[in-house]
Interface confidence: medium
């Protein structure tokens, strides 16, 4: 058991053009309140229960009256947290719907009027006992900033609130076989009451001797991950050893999508594609007009002036779905060639190219020598991510445009002296050496080592290196 806590930080106009009108006016003062609905993200039982994990309603916020001519600011919020208690284990993956409601405080007959200002939804992974997670969601032109966490209620602890803790019986240590309860080091893990061998990470129990599995785990002791990879068919024979899914209905069998929505299976659950005018996890939310702000992620709502006429959301780039609720992962299509990295900027895709490539999709290879000139008789060599020039003697630089000092590399061996020459370099060898680079010692009897000196050159003469 535990509590899911939601802290609303701000609700106001989102960034960008098209700031929404203030929902309140001098003639119609109003105040906000919030509703949160939680569902186990991968759970089949959510089909029967709209908010299977629980729901909560906030207090009403301060009364707000718009200042004439002023843009809609962040609106005053209710005090305190929204708290959704959960009785069973925390599922780890959950779906949320957060609705922002407006309560109009004019002279309505029959009391205040309520209307839905914005609705955001999402799926998240969250371990109980962890820090606050921050989130920003947009609904039409509105932006909601909030934080959430799940915490266990004593004596439960752990990421799923399935382990139990009790105060220490002895001041110094826990009983035999029992560990201290981090982070409550002054408490001890309660004696195991689940079925012997029940996985402490993936199983839990509410009655002594039972072993109930968390989402994604199966087997009598919840030690087998649910997987269809080793089954004969997508829902083949059940086995604690293979870890196949239990035979029976698939996520889309019986179509959990209401109001004519179409169902498609995801790896461990399902997804509904809703007809116009309906949305929600199962297309269960209806009677929505453009005034309700049904288009998420900056989508533009047209039509739908009354609940009987369907609205249409025109989605910005990068989003799809009847309510622009689905982000298109355009980078998953791997549009960048040659190992470029993909950036989805929302309005456009960008490729960050590896060195040696260019173009919108990194499709141009800069490594090519085609059309690339190496000056002064140099030749182009491919490789290494950019063209390279192998320069003729006396030239250097990327394109062989720089005149090189042929003596810079000290080419004359054995103390020979180097002289730059229009056709290259000349080595004046020290006594006892000869050759183009003074590399050959002259034998004491006057004969040189191989190769022999060219005719007409005495050992010790300057050798021209052509």
């Amino acid at each position: 058991a535990g509590v899911f806590e939601l802290q609303i930080h701000s609700f106001g106009p989102g960034p960008g053009p098209g700031a929404p009108r203030s929902p309140c006016s001098a003639r119609l003062p109003c105040r906000l309140f919030f509703r949160v609905c939680l569902k186990p993200g991968l759970s089949e039982e959510a089909a029967e229960s709209p908010c299977a994990l629980g729901a909560a309603l906030s207090a009403r916020g301060p009364v707000y009256t718009e200042q004439p001519g002023a843009p809609a600011p962040d609106l005053p919020l209710p005090d305190g947290l929204l708290q959704v208690p959960f009785r069973d284990a925390w599922p780890g993956t959950f779906s949320f719907i957060i609705e922002t409601w407006r309560e109009e405080l004019g002279d309505q007959i029959g009391g205040p009027a309520w209307s839905l200002l914005a609705r955001v939804a999402g799926r998240r992974r969250l371990a109980a006992g962890g820090p606050w997670a921050r989130d920003i969601q947009r609904a039409g032109a509105w932006e909601l900033r909030f934080s959430y966490r799940a915490r266990c209620e004593p004596p439960a602890v752990g990421t799923a609130c399935t382990r139990l803790c009790r105060p220490r019986s002895a001041p110094s240590r826990c009983g035999p076989g029992l560990r201290p309860c981090a982070p409550l080091e002054d408490e001890c893990e309660a004696p195991l009451v689940c079925r012997a061998g029940c996985s402490p990470e993936h199983g839990f129990c509410e009655q002594p001797g039972e072993c109930r599995c968390l989402e994604g785990w199966t087997g009598p002791l919840c030690t087998v991950p649910v997987s269809t990879s080793s089954c004969l068919s997508p829902r083949g024979p059940s086995s604690a050893t293979t870890g196949c899914l239990v035979p029976g209905p698939g996520p889309c069998d019986g179509n959990p999508c209401a109001n004519g929505g179409s169902c498609s299976e995801t790896p461990r659950s399902f997804e509904c594609t809703c007809p116009r005018g309906f949305y929600g996890l199962r297309c269960e939310v209806s009677g929505v007009t453009c005034a309700d702000g049904p288009c998420f992620n900056g989508g533009l709502c047209v039509g739908g002036a009354d609940p009987d006429s369907a609205y249409i959301c025109h989605c910005p780039p990068g989003f799809q779905g009847s309510n622009c609720e689905k982000r298109v992962d355009r980078c998953s299509l791997q549009p960048c060639r040659n190992g470029g990295l993909c950036l989805d900027l929302g309005h456009a895709l960008r490729c960050r190219c590896r060195a040696g490539f260019a173009g919108p999709r990194c499709e141009h290879d800069l490594d090519d020598c085609a059309g690339r000139a190496c000056a002064n008789g140099g030749t182009c060599v491919e490789g290494g991510g950019a063209h390279r020039c192998s320069c003729a003697l006396g030239f250097g630089g990327r394109d062989c445009r720089e005149r090189a000092d042929p003596c810079a590399a000290r080419p004359c061996a054995h103390g020979g002296r180097c002289y730059a020459h229009f056709s290259g370099l000349v080595c004046a060898c020290a006594p006892g050496y000869m050759g183009a680079r003074c590399e050959f010692p002259v034998h004491p009897d006057g004969a040189s080592a191989l190769p022999a000196a060219p005719p007409g050159l005495r050992p010790g003469d300057p050798q021209r290196y052509l």
Partner: antibody, heavy 119, light 107 residues
Framework: EVQLVQSGAEVKKPGASVKVSCKAS????????MHWVRQAPGQRLEWMGV????????NYNQEFKGRVTLTVDTSASTAYMELSSLRSEDTAVYYC????????????WGQGTTVTVSS | DIVMTQSPDSLAVSLGERATINCRAT??????LAWYQQKPGQTNKLLIF???TLQSGVPDRFSGSGSGTDFTLTISSLQAEDVAVYYC?????????FGGGTKVEIK
């Protein structure tokens, strides 16, 4: 001298997560992308993803369906690969490999980290 | 994804003889193929990239050729230290993919 030193062997239970580290030295960490590759026993090498340490932009192999997360700590010149919802078939040697940033993809490799997934 | 197929799976060659390994891609990868050497207890070593460019520090008895879908790694004169498993890898597009490997031994 360029060196990539990886963290030690890990033994994990199915469903758990593992985080492997790769400490780089001998070059400017943020100037070179980092790839992660794994090799299951008797199997071919399998590319998992690449990250640019300068701003953490990454590209993942869709085969891993969101189970892989690549991160970096530039102050420690260290890259990390986290793999969640482990299965027995994730038992493998996991390598980090530096991207040369020119036409050659992976010019220096880590020594590998053995991850064993067993109940 | 591009599938890389290497042949043969293993190869036994006498010292000083030529060893040839082939790699085929299921679609054209232009020249963007790399070859790696894997030895037990050592880090993997890049030998060739872009089909035929020799990585610096690699002996010139290793050479690569080919483009499009068919590529070859040749060791012109096999040395004892060349005993290893060799992998090809396309670096044309993500996801990068590797061949199944060729084990080279001395006959």
């Amino acid at each position: 001298e360029v060196q990539l030193v990886q963290s030690g062997a890990e033994v994990k239970k199915p469903g758990a997560s593992v985080k492997v580290s790769c400490k780089a030295s001998g070059y400017t960490f943020t100037s070179y992308w980092m790839h992660w590759v794994r090799q299951a026993p008797g199997q071919r090498l399998e590319w998992m993803g690449v990250i640019d340490p300068s701003d953490s932009l990454a590209n993942y192999n869709q085969e891993f369906k969101g189970r892989v997360t690549l991160t970096v700590d530039t102050s420690a010149s260290t890259a990390y690969m986290e793999l969640s919802s482990l299965r027995s078939e994730d038992t493998a040697v996991y390598y980090c490999a530096r991207d040369s940033t020119v036409v050659a993809p992976m010019d220096y490799w880590g020594q590998g980290t053995t991850v064993t997934v067993s109940s | 994804d591009i599938v890389m197929t290497q042949s043969p799976d293993s190869l036994a060659v006498s010292l000083g003889e030529r060893a040839t390994i082939n790699c085929r891609a299921t679609k054209s990868i232009s020249k963007y193929l790399a070859w790696y050497q894997q030895k037990p207890g050592q880090t993997n070593k890049l030998l060739i990239f872009s089909g035929s460019t020799l990585q610096s520090g690699v002996p010139d008895r290793f050479s690569g050729s080919g483009s499009g879908t068919d590529f070859t790694l040749t060791i012109s004169s096999l040395q004892a230290e060349d005993v290893a498993v060799y992998y090809c890898q396309q670096h044309h597009e993500y996801p990068y993919t590797f061949g199944g490997g060729t084990k080279v031994e001395i006959k």
